[in-house]
């Protein structure tokens, strides 16, 4: 049964011109009714009755989950990160078998010295978090490691992380060219083999607010869009006010349907309103107001 209970006596006229009587139910929305126990809950669009009220699925709301929300919560991560897989060759330390064992004192000491050296190298990069040695091997010591970068999420986060990875490449190239052995001795904290520096791989956090917005909007994906305010993304329909894409319904109410946003125009005591944006007013004739 698809019976509805009117909850409002407002008379609305659709932009096509026909008058419709409405509770706030979108008659074009496909509905499915959820029945739990003996309780015909009238929870539509996949909503379910929790014993007190309908629990609606995004993007629906209302007593019977019959209306479509104007905005959907999307939560970008607070921070985004990049991981660079690098290899450098340290020439000022000779490889010993103990370095293979990550729990050995030798490995811990090497890890500490290498981390200190890399902290110095990358000290001017605000996105730099640290290094993580993944493997040490012979030659003198070939150090396979990750350089970790992190930044606050902004719409331009990819550019920020891409720039940071470029600076990492420049700085590691510079230090491994400058800090080299002279007469079999190293005067720096660590010395390197210039030719042993390689960037194997770069992985950047993938977050697309548009994609999240479209997924959450489900069958309304074509009508929801992302707009930014204070660098924060908002997933909105044109019925959400205060954004560039907001639909102005003037003398009417914006409502989402599967064909997009439309204006339901009001009829007042003195005027009929019509038009796509309910901006065409027709005065009712022979009507007098007495104050």
């Amino acid at each position: 049964p698809l019976a509805t209970i009117p909850v409002s006596t407002t008379s609305l006229t659709s932009s096509e011109g026909s008058t419709i009587s409405t509770p706030s139910v979108d008659i074009s929305t496909p509905v499915t009714t959820s029945i739990v126990g003996d309780q015909c809950s009238r929870c539509k669009n996949g909503g379910f009755w929790d014993g007190l009220k309908c629990q609606c699925l995004t993007p629906y709301y209302g007593e019977s989950c019959e209306e479509v929300v104007n905005s959907i919560d999307i939560a970008p991560p607070e921070t985004v990160s990049a991981q660079m897989e690098l290899t450098v060759t340290v020439t000022s330390v000779k490889f010993t078998d103990e370095l293979k064992n990550h729990s050995s004192q030798e490995f811990r000491e090497f890890n500490k010295t290498f981390t200190e050296q890399m902290n110095i190298v990358y000290s001017g990069i605000p996105e730099y978090v640290g290094v993580n040695i993944t493997n040490l091997r012979l030659g003198s010591v070939v150090v396979e490691h990750d350089v970790l970068l992190r930044t606050k999420y902004t719409p331009e986060y990819k550019t920020a992380l891409d720039n940071a990875t470029e600076v990492v490449k420049q700085k590691i190239t510079k230090v491994t060219t400058e800090q080299i052995m002279t007469n079999d001795n190293c005067s720096a904290l660590m010395c390197f083999n210039t030719t042993g520096t390689q960037v194997q791989n770069i992985t950047v956090t993938q977050y697309d607010p548009v994609e999240e917005c479209r997924q959450k909007a489900e069958e309304y994906e074509d009508y929801f869009l992302v707009e930014y305010r204070d660098q924060k993304p908002y997933c909105i329909s044109p019925c959400e006010s205060g954004f560039n894409a907001s639909k102005n319904c003037n003398h009417g109410k914006c409502q989402m349907s599967q064909n997009g946003a439309r204006c339901l125009c009001v009829t007042t005591e003195t005027h009929w309103y019509s038009g796509e944006d309910c901006n065409q007013g027709t005065q009712k004739s022979h009507h007098h107001h007495h104050h």
């Epitope: 000022s92 490889f95 010993t96 103990e98 010295t113 001795n185 190293c186």
Partner: nanobody, 123 residues
Framework: DVQLQASGGGLVQPGGSLRLSCAAS????????MAWFRQAPGKEREGVAF???????SYAESVKGRFTISRDNALSSLYLQMNSLRAEDTAVYYC?????????????????WGQGTMVTVSS
């Protein structure tokens, strides 16, 4: 826990000799690198010499041919034989160690340090 104890410093005349010792406890004597550093009044700490587990040695240019570094793995000790001493050798001498086979006299590469012993070369 690694502990280093330096000794043997003193007052000596120019051209004289001294032998510094460094006793290491908790340090795997057959591994890593041991070194001598010095710091003259008002100057930066500088590397004097280091010796690796396999006996490989390296010296600062200013002491080459005059100083000899050696280690006794059985006694877990490090030595610095200093001959033909000069006034500019006056400094506090420190022994240092690393578990790694190092080829650097950069002080920051050595995590373990002994307290200093004072060497004064004066007539």
């Amino acid at each position: 826990d690694v502990q280093l104890q330096a000794s043997g410093g003193g007052l000596v005349q120019p051209g004289g000799s001294l032998r510094l010792s460094c006793a290491a406890s908790g340090f795997p004597s057959s591994r890593g690198t041991m070194a001598w550093f010095r710091q003259a009044p008002g100057k930066e700490r500088e590397g004097v010499a280091f010796i690796n587990s396999d006996g490989r040695t390296s010296y600062a240019e200013s002491v080459k041919g005059r100083f000899t570094i050696s280690r006794d793995n059985a006694l877990s000790s490090l030595y610095l034989q200093m001959n033909s001493l000069r006034a500019e050798d006056t400094a506090v001498y420190y022994c240092a160690a690393s578990l790694l086979y190092l080829m650097t006299v950069n002080a920051a590469a050595y995590p373990y340090w002994g307290q200093g012993t004072m060497v004064t070369v004066s007539s």
